[in-house]
């Protein structure tokens, strides 16, 4: 259905009062041309008076006809002043004006609340030429009005550098209540009061609100919008919605679920991402959060060895990113690992326990009693040591790494030798004479290289010197022993 508004052709207005056209104008036009009583006011002033008229919608053309008669004032005819219609209905209204044929290229534009309406609107201008004047009818139609079409519409016509403006057409769109604020899903503490808000607007006003909980009305008497519902507390999940009523009917908001906060479910899928000798990187999939965000998680670690004392190590971490590196573990050991997370209500149960192992460690102790002596006859340096006391978790000894550094006259070079695990001695060739050789030894397992022994230095003289007594690992307190004989 289209509401069509035409110009007044009756002595009384189609829509309220004087806007437009319920009375004749306050002034009479300059020339007594026959016209409908619905013309807009035309300001009277002397034809010889220069300048533009005081009223913006009237233009006095300065051009005269062959008989030098001044032309009448130009003004839009009165049309409907106020249209009330329901949302989604169609509407058509128009402006019309009669323009002397001496004017060319007249265009009419439509404006709404001070802004020109361009583009996607159905505006049609029709021209009906006669001998002396052309009747112009500008129609504006909206096929399915929305609330946003509410407003004051006017026509404007540019002619001879004058702007002629119509009186406004007020378009008031009414419809079912429109929600500006709907209740929101919430997670609440058991038996604790909370509020829900619902706000809807017309037109038409007023809008009344009924609250619905689990399909049953909460309030017998409607409340004026906006309405705040205070729920004293819930013991189980509930669904709330609100109904907004006005004269056009009823609109129902979305239903929102109100959840009761609970302790989280335990994490699942705890898995080992990476193991080293002394750390294990784990990840987990958080369980259901109990409608309350996780605050932090706790990683519980206990030795899986039946002979261990069963103590539990606890590591606290943030809830994100569901990843934690457990440190300070023993090498080559078995552990049971569980994860628990908490929200504001409390801690979850612990996840299913998983078994994890650390890898072999590097030796924790350096070889002992390192001695170094020069065998001048073979031009070698002999090195001896004692195997370090390895722990089981340090893994199986696979050999030794010997570092020997040769320093002479500002030049220094370091060489590394690898020795199999069975030996406790090694021989290295003299690299430079008249130099100091500094030796350090480290034990090696599959877990890595252990700490190096304290350095032992020996001076290698030029050829022809006597034999040497050995240099050995320093006694405590001697930082840098050098034995020269």
């Amino acid at each position: 259905a289209i509401t069509e508004a035409r110009e007044e052709a009756k002595p009384y207005p189609l829509f309220p009062g004087p806007f437009p056209g319920s009375l004749q104008t306050d002034h009479t036009p300059l020339l007594s041309l026959p016209h409908a009583s619905g013309y807009q006011p035309a300001l009277m002033f002397s034809p010889t008076q220069p300048g533009r008229p005081h009223t913006g919608n009237v233009a006095i053309p300065q051009v005269t006809s062959v008989e030098s008669k001044p032309l009448p004032p130009l003004a839009f005819k009165h049309t409907v002043g106020h249209i009330i219609l329901s949302e989604h209905k169609g509407v058509k209204f128009n402006c019309s004006i009669s323009v002397p044929n001496i004017y060319q290229d007249t265009t009419i534009s439509w404006w709404k609340d001070g802004k020109e309406l361009l583009g996607a609107h159905h505006a049609i201008t029709q021209f009906y030429p006669d001998d002396e004047v052309t009747a112009i009818i500008a129609s504006f139609s909206i096929t399915s009005v929305q609330r946003s079409d509410n407003g004051s519409y006017i026509c404007k016509m540019k002619i001879n550098n004058e702007e002629i403006v119509s009186d406004p057409i007020y378009i008031e769109v009414q419809g079912l209540p429109h929600f500006t604020k709907q209740p929101e899903s919430m997670n609440v503490t058991r038996n604790t009061a909370f509020n829900l808000t619902c706000q809807a607007v017309g037109p038409p006003e007023p809008v009344n609100i009924f609250w619905v909980q689990n399909s049953s009305r909460v309030n017998e008497q409607p409340e004026k919008s906006p309405s705040v519902l205070t729920v004293p507390g819930l013991t189980e999940m509930a669904v709330f919605s609100c109904e907004a009523h006005n004269d056009k009917g009823l609109t129902v908001s979305k239903g929102v679920q109100i959840n009761i906060k609970a302790i989280p479910s335990p994490p699942t899928e705890v898995s080992i991402r990476n193991s080293t000798a002394h750390s294990i990187l784990i990840s987990w999939v958080p369980g259901f959060d109990g409608y309350s965000p996780f605050r932090n998680c706790s990683i519980q670690v206990k030795e899986a060895d039946p002979l261990s004392n069963g103590s539990v190590m606890i590591f606290n971490t943030s809830a994100l990113p569901h990843l934690y590196q457990i440190k300070q573990l023993q090498a080559l050991a078995n552990y049971s690992i569980g994860v628990s997370c908490m929200n504001e209500i409390g801690w979850s149960a612990v996840s299913p326990w998983i078994l994890a192992s650390t890898t072999e460690g590097a030796p924790s102790v350096a070889p002992l009693n390192v001695t170094v002596f020069l065998n001048e006859s073979s031009d070698n340096v002999d090195i001896r040591w004692m195997k370090p006391p390895t722990k089981q978790q340090d893994g199986e000894l696979v050999g030794y790494r010997i570092s020997h550094v040769w320093q002479s006259a500002g030049i220094s070079k370091e060489l590394l030798e690898e020795v199999g695990q069975n030996g406790s001695r090694a021989r290295i060739s003299v690299q430079v004479h008249n130099a100091t050789c500094t030796v350090r030894i480290a034990a090696v397992t599959r877990g890595g290289v252990g700490p190096f022994s304290d350095p032992v230095k020996i001076f290698i003289p030029a050829h022809g010197w006597v034999d040497y007594a050995p240099s050995s690992t320093p006694a405590p307190g001697n930082a840098d022993p050098v034995l020269i004989i």
Epitope: P13, L14, F15, P16, H54, V58, W111, I154, I164, D167
Partner: antibody, heavy 118, light 112 residues
């Protein structure tokens, strides 16, 4: 939000004129009618007339023709009412009001008191 | 002119009571569009009039649901279901169907 701000109180002599203003904000001034209403102390309300600022068309209550002149300045979004040949009968509070989309005077200025006294 | 006769001139009430104000027009206020342009205003002491009800029965934005309007043609009523202290003042009806617009003479709502 829509607001109409009127000029301050006036004390004027009989036989003179006074021009009071009504500055609009919060909406398109050229799109809505401005109406003027008179209220004498302890009395009812009297409708004076309207102006449509978009084209400066006016409509007057016969009672106030020749007494009131309505104008508008779109550049400052201000409507004016000039009262001429003042007498003690013109002593009153004058209100401007906007005719809203609902075709009611939905927003009013705070009023301007005019006192005519010798 | 459409003459608006408002009764009573003064209405003493107790807080919490219902109040009813009548407005009668000398001619029908229904326009040819089927709408009736009769509005109700409240003017509190020292303030401008404020719109309560538009077109007979529509509450203006922000107006409490204690206020309701009814009527048609020439007879109209404003009801306040439970009077509160903030409701005190002078109530006017206004018709905008016919020019000139005309107001009722006002009803002063006061405490008994």
């Amino acid at each position: 939000q829509v607001q109409l701000q009127q000029s301050g109180p006036e004390l004027v002599k009989p036989g003179t004129s006074v021009k009071i203003s009504c500055k609009a904000s919060g909406y398109s001034f050229t799109s809505y009618y401005i109406h003027w209403v008179k209220q004498r102390p302890g009395q009812g309300l009297d409708w004076i007339g309207w102006i449509f600022p978009g084209n400066r068309n006016t409509q007057y209550n016969e009672k106030f023709k020749g007494k009131a002149t309505l104008t508008a300045d779109t550049s400052s979004s201000t409507a004016y009412m000039q009262l001429s040949s003042l007498t003690s009968e013109d002593s009153a509070v004058y209100y401007c009001a906007r005719l809203g989309l609902i075709y009611a005077l939905d927003y009013w200025g705070q009023g301007t008191s005019v006192t005519v006294s010798s | 002119d459409a003459v608006m006769t408002q009764t009573p001139l003064s209405l003493p009430v107790s807080l919490g009571d219902q109040a009813s104000i009548s407005c009668r027009s000398s001619q029908s206020l229904e326009n040819s569009n089927g709408h009736t342009y009769l509005h109700w205003y409240l003017q509190k002491p020292g303030q401008s009039p404020q719109l309560l009800i538009y077109r007979v029965s529509n509450r203006f934005s922000g107006v409490q649901d204690r206020f309701s309007g009814s009527g048609s043609g020439t007879d109209f009523t404003l009801k306040i279901s439970r009077v509160e202290a903030e409701d005190l003042g002078v109530y006017f009806c206004l018709q905008v169907t016919h020019v000139p617009f005309t107001f009722g003479s006002g009803t002063k709502l006061e405490i008994k």
